[in-house]
């Protein structure tokens, strides 16, 4: 009775809600519900009826498979969808699909919280900022991943000369998308002592660059 399937999709996509098994033979009626009481569509004796709901005009039922096609899902469509089938015997069978609609993650901005040269070691604190999202973080130094225990929104680490990196990348991801932000230091970890600055690829229209004080006079930095 309680078949529950989880589906995660990206907002703006077209989605087909369907069950993995065949429908009962010669069923009498099939109904899709949004949550538990809001009918979306009902198929009854060779005819579909679409109900007035927020889905009207953007759903279509395939009565042969029972699949419900929804165009352009949005986060507000997050819900449990129920397909209820009335068999010839009079028994009902029910399938549930929990649909989670996620927005693609935005591009992260890396903020330099602190950078300090300490006895040839480099203390680095970078934060990866995106607007209130539940995401996973992965940090890379020159494209090599940092250890798992450092994988959160703030990268705080002390680097030794042999493992300095010029560029640091924060990858944010959810189950439907991922985006990167990268910053580069020039030269590694001497930002405070020399008057060199750091600029993110965001500011440079996606390019990744090493940048120094004199470049900044010709580049408007937000």
């Amino acid at each position: 009775q309680g078949h529950l399937v989880h589906m995660t999709v990206v907002s703006g996509s077209n989605v087909t809600l369907n069950i993995s098994e065949s429908l009962p033979e010669n069923y009498k009626q099939l109904t899709w519900f949004y949550t538990f009481d809001q009918k979306i569509v009902e198929w009854d004796s060779r005819k579909s009826k679409y109900f007035e709901s927020k889905f009207k005009g953007r759903v279509r039922l395939d009565p042969q498979s029972g699949a419900l096609y929804i165009s352009k899902v949005q986060k507000e469509d997050n819900s449990t969808y129920i397909m209820r089938v009335l068999k010839k015997t009079g028994n009902e069978q029910e399938w549930k699909i929990k649909l989670q609609v996620l927005d693609p993650v935005p591009k992260p901005v890396i903020k330099i919280e602190k950078i300090e040269d300490m006895d040839d070691n480099c203390y680095l604190k970078l934060s990866c900022v995106i607007p209130g999202e539940s995401v996973n973080y992965t940090w890379y130094g020159d494209k090599r991943p940092f250890p798992k225990e450092l994988q959160n929104s703030v990268l705080e680490t002390t680097l030794m000369p042999h493992n300095y990196s010029r560029c640091y990348t924060c990858q944010v991801s959810n189950s439907v998308s991922s985006k990167n932000g990268t910053v580069c230091l020039s030269p590694p970890c001497t930002l405070a002592r020399s008057e060199q600055k750091l600029i993110s690829e965001e500011d440079l229209g996606g390019e990744q660059k090493l940048i120094s004080e004199e470049d900044l006079h010709h580049h408007h930095h937000h």
Epitope: Y50, G57, K72
Partner: antibody
């Protein structure tokens, strides 16, 4: 039985507006979308848009955005299509049609068509 | 925007013959395609929807097949009243809009 009866032929000058009506009978008017389709002489079918008679919500083909208005009067079980700033190439037969099952996908009952001529 | 291309533009056959009309979509429309028949001076009539479902009252000699981008309307044995123009139709999702193919004229040979 389901029927859609449209208003009669209209002649207009360029720049004017035209209103075509479509009176429904034989089914629950608010359960199904009403679509408007036009057909220029000797040409194919061109979808203009739909109205949901229950909510009054409309959706138009991009080509007609800003020039077409679709309304309905549920007490008169009638849908209306207004097309403004008419040009000579707007001359066509305009059809209203009901969709097959309330999904907005296919058109199964059609009006008889309304001929609109546009010339100065 | 999805474009539907019908072929041939004109098909000349005799009553009793089998007619095969084709409709190709510029990108996949799954099974969401319909076929209409239009006779001179008349409104179109829905024949097939969801690629293969016959609309109410449509004779069994009309059948539809296909999915994705390639669809076929078959008339198994042509009757004199079947000579007309046939259109395929699909619905795009966003913004929701309906498009028709340019039509195939089925004429008596």
């Amino acid at each position: 039985q389901v029927q859609l009866v449209q208003s009669g032929a209209e002649a207009r000058e360029p720049g004017a507006s035209v209103r075509v009506s479509c009176k429904a009978s034989g089914y629950t008017f608010t359960d199904y979308f009403i679509h408007w389709v036009r057909q220029a002489p000797g040409q194919g079918l061109e979808w203009m848009g739909w109205i949901n008679p229950n909510s009054g919500a409309t959706n138009f083909a991009q080509k007609f955005q800003g020039r077409v208005t679709m309304t309905r009067d549920t007490s008169l079980i009638t849908a209306y299509m207004d097309l403004s700033r008419l040009k000579s190439d707007d001359a066509a037969v305009f059809y209203c049609a009901r969709d097959v099952d309330g999904s907005g996908w296919y058109l199964d009952f059609w009006g008889q068509g309304t001929l609109v001529t546009v010339s100065s | 925007e999805i474009v539907l291309t019908q072929s041939p533009a004109t098909l000349s056959l005799s009553p009793g013959e089998r007619a095969t009309l084709s409709c190709r979509a510029s990108q996949s429309v799954s099974i969401y395609l319909a076929w209409y028949q239009q006779k001179p001076g008349q409104a179109p009539r829905l024949l097939i929807y969801d690629a293969s479902n016959r609309a109410t009252g449509i004779p069994a000699r009309f059948s539809g097949s296909g999915s994705g981008t390639d669809f076929t309307l078959t008339i198994s044995r042509l009757e004199p009243e079947d000579f007309a123009v046939y259109y395929c139709q699909q619905r795009s999702d966003w913004p929701p809009s309906i498009t028709f193919g340019q039509g195939t004229r089925l004429e008596i040979k």
